[in-house]
């Protein structure tokens, strides 16, 4: 199982839930669905309120139980590190896989923190980010932002993604805007 | 009590195709995940494959993955294991079992010229 | 591919305890409370013994009980009777083959 680590603005928009928590328990593999179950300890809610409706609390992650069919390993033992997940709802369940951003809070950068936040929201409905793969690439429409990080280093690692989100400029257009100048 | 009866299995040749079954009685079957496992003759035991109580997840060891496909017909109480592009290395005795508690008594395959 | 390791064979008088051991990694035995334990008789299918590390399934005898420390899972049969004598393997779930067994112990009651 293969996949592009995405901006965290396009992870961010395109999760059902996007919480922060704690793995606090043994891994589990549910002898009916073959799904491997984490138990979780959310510590904030920043997306999935209406979703989840008044079920807000979430006990558990779900993932496949087989790396090949993109099942997510948590590899970190540390019960009190805190984490970034966005994942799916499915049957009122938090999905996630290998493709899901999951990711130690304390190794997101400020502006990150501020994406998810209170940003990041901003630019779900009318702005894109658009990953740039290969030269030349052209912006498809003016609500696209082009996300060139993975020319020049790791995805994740990018000047984009740690510090810039795509919001809305003006109707119709979006640009990358910082998210350093935002933090008051 | 659970039960389960393998059948299918018989002399094919290499690059030949089969299609293993097992017919599960005494428990929910739907409830329950499904694996085959395998047992070259004198050698230890391989797991080959598994699927969800649903039939909508399913894995594969690498030594199979692309060659065989397991299914389930929730409506029958059968498993099924469809082996394609065989190998001599496939030779085995074929078990099923309900994730891993009750086995059958095998099904013995064999690849040869 | 032989994913566990377990030795190869392993033997004791009747009366005595046996123990088999099934060593792993932080992937399989060490990462998760899925190691279970299978008796088999010649020309006859696997057994379950133990489950879960330590559970044993309605029927099978006190004698057996199993345990875990580290990545090394084991299995200790006690009061060693003559219809112990047969193979036997251990079995983790593993996150990247899904489920892996040991090569197997032949157990003899001399």
């Known amino acids: 199982c293969t996949c592009v680590p995405p901006h965290p603005q396009t992870a961010f928009c395109n999760s059902d839930l996007v919480i922060r928590a704690k793995f606090v328990g043994t891994p589990e593999v549910n002898q009916t669905t073959l799904y491997q179950r984490y138990e979780i300890k959310m510590t904030k809610m920043y997306k999935g309120f209406q979703a989840l409706g008044d079920a807000a609390d979430i006990r558990f992650v779900y993932t496949p139980a087989m790396e090949s069919v993109c099942g997510y390993f948590h590899r970190s033992h540390n019960r009190s590190e805190e984490f970034l997940i966005a994942g799916k709802l499915q049957d009122g369940l938090l999905h996630i896989t290998t493709c899901s951003f999951v990711a130690p809070w304390n190794s997101l950068s400020l502006a990150q923190r501020r994406g998810f936040t209170k940003t990041y929201t901003v630019g779900c409905e009318e702005c894109t980010v658009f990953p740039c793969l290969s030269i030349p690439c052209k912006l498809q429409s003016g609500t696209h932002c082009l996300w060139t990080d993975q020319l020049l280093q790791g995805s994740e690692k990018g000047f984009q993604s740690r510090h810039l989100a795509c919001l809305p400029r003006e109707p119709g257009l979006c640009t990358w805007q910082s998210l350093r100048s935002q933090i008051a | 009590q659970v039960q389960l009866v393998e059948s299918g299995g018989g002399l094919v040749q290499p690059g030949g195709s089969l299609r293993l079954s097992c017919a599960a009685s005494?428990?929910?079957?739907?409830?329950?995940?499904m694996s085959w496992v395998r047992q070259a003759p004198g050698k230890g035991l391989e797991w080959v494959s598994a699927i969800s109580g649903s039939g909508g997840s399913t894995y594969y060891a690498d030594s199979v993955k692309g060659r065989f496909t397991i299914s389930r017909d929730n409506s029958k109480n059968t498993l099924y294991l469809q082996m394609n592009s065989l190998r001599a290395e496939d030779t085995a005795v074929y078990y099923c079992?309900?994730?891993?508690?009750?086995w059958g008594q095998g099904t013995l395959v064999t690849v040869s010229s | 591919d032989i994913a566990l390791t377990q030795p190869a064979s392993v033997s004791g008088s009747p009366g005595q305890s046996i123990t088999i051991s099934c060593t792993g990694t932080s992937s399989d035995v060490g990462g998760y409370n899925y190691v279970s334990w299978y008796q088999q008789h010649p020309g006859k299918a696997p057994k379950l013994m133990i489950y879960d590390v330590s559970n044993r399934p309605s029927g099978v005898s006190n004698r057996f009980s199993g345990s875990k420390s580290g990545n090394t899972a084991s299995l200790t049969i006690s009061g060693l009777q003559a219809e112990d004598e047969a193979d036997y393997y251990c079995q983790s779930y593993d996150f990247r083959r899904f489920s892996v067994f040991g090569g197997g112990t032949k157990l003899t009651v001399l």
């Open positions: 005494g428990f929910t079957f739907s409830s329950y995940a």
């Open positions: 079992a309900r994730f891993f508690d009750y």
